[in-house]
């Protein structure tokens, strides 16, 4: 049975130009974390495998950098990313737990922070 | 829809060197997480791991066969080619490639039909 | 070399519930040996079921499972098809290289 549940840091906004840490936690489980693969809308930016480390896109080599922990650092935001994006954590015995991120990348030097959320 | 097919000589002599193709359409080896591995099954026997090969160029190979095996990939061609040096009638097997996904753990997702490889003087 | 072994041949009943195992000879099956689960039925292409232990493929239905018990991986059928009358082959992945099992072929009667 799936008890755990993501928090992500929910709906998120930046500056263009800047960088943006991409974060989720799975809470309420004991389940082990093997693999957490990031995907921006069908796209896979990145993975984190327990055993093999870091693996980066090459399409998004030059703007993702691992971490901090299983998240990931979005840099030299455009206003292309703003959009939808996931952490798929794979766990056993649990099974796949998603959280989802939503990312507005602003023109101006306004960008609130959004409150954070949880996912069942 | 994933395919992939291997092809190469049906028969080679001991000692020779033993080249497959494997060529695949649906997928690209320039993409992200995909991979491409070969095993092999001599008749009546299980299943043997021999090497594979991810988008990023890194190289795995089976350590009791490593000094004997290259893997190597042409992505323009959609293509993984296996060479096997110094063969000998006990390499007479059947030999498949396997499309390899990083992402999901479904590391031998997709299977080719595989290719009969004698080995006989 | 570790050597991977799987019951060589298993029997059950349409309805029934029947579980594969795959033991190692280095010790016990951990989730770091990321345990495939792969089919062939007669005629037919080899195909992936379960990868990483646990992550069952797009196209396989639920009745398939992957876990661990005890120091084994395993791969449990619920309610079992005539259609799953097939070989099943187990591969361990050892930090840099894989090793399959001999295979358990599966008999549904």
């Known amino acids: 049975m799936m008890t755990g549940t993501i928090e992500t840091t929910g709906n998120i906004s930046a500056e263009k130009g800047g960088s943006i840490i991409l974060q989720c936690h799975l809470s309420s489980t004991t389940a082990q974390v093997t693999q957490v693969n990031w995907e921006q809308q069908d796209q896979l930016l990145a993975i984190c495998n327990a055993d093999l480390g870091w693996h980066i896109s090459p399409s998004f080599k030059d703007r993702v950098a691992p971490g901090p922990g299983l998240g990931l650092t979005l840099q030299s935001l455009t206003v292309n990313d703003t959009g939808e994006y996931f952490c798929i954590y794979h766990t056993y015995p649990d099974g796949t737990y998603t959280g989802r991120i939503f990312l507005e990348v602003l023109e101006s030097s306004v960008a609130e922070h959004g409150a954070r959320f949880q996912i069942p | 829809q994933v395919t992939l097919k291997e092809s190469g000589p049906t028969l080679v002599k001991p000692t020779q060197t033993l080249t497959l193709t494997c060529t695949f359409s649906?997928?690209?080896?320039?993409?992200?997480?995909?991979?491409v591995g070969w095993i092999r099954q001599p008749p009546g026997k299980a299943l043997e791991w021999l090497a594979h090969?991810?988008?990023?160029?890194?190289?795995y190979y089976n350590p009791a066969l490593k000094s004997r095996l290259t893997i190597t990939k042409d992505t323009s061609k959609n293509q993984v080619v296996l060479t096997m040096t110094n063969m000998d009638p006990v390499d007479t097997a059947t030999y498949y490639c396997?499309?390899?996904?990083?992402?999901?753990?479904?590391?031998?997702?997709?299977w080719g039909q595989g290719t009969l490889v004698t080995v006989s003087s | 070399q570790a050597v991977v072994t799987q019951e060589p041949s298993l029997t059950v009943s349409p309805g029934g519930t029947v579980t594969l195992t795959c033991r190692s000879s280095?010790?016990?099956?951990?989730?770091?040996?990321?345990a495939n689960w792969v089919q062939q039925k007669p005629g037919q292409l080899f195909r992936g079921l379960i990868g990483?232990?646990?992550n069952r493929a797009p196209w396989v239905p639920a009745r398939f499972s992957g876990s661990l018990i005890g120091d084994k991986a395993a791969l449990t059928l619920s309610g079992v098809q005539p259609e799953d009358e097939a070989e099943y082959f187990c591969?361990?992945?050892?930090?840099?290289?894989?090793?399959f099992g001999g295979g358990t072929k599966l008999t549904v009667l």
């Open positions: 591969a361990l992945w050892y930090s840099n290289h894989w090793v």
């Open positions: 280095t010790g016990a099956v951990t989730t770091s040996n990321y």
């Open positions: 649906g997928f690209s080896l320039s993409t992200f997480a995909m991979g």
């Open positions: 990483g232990t646990n």
């Open positions: 090969i991810w988008w990023d160029d890194d190289k």
């Open positions: 396997a499309r390899m996904d990083y992402s999901y753990f479904a590391w031998f997702a997709y």
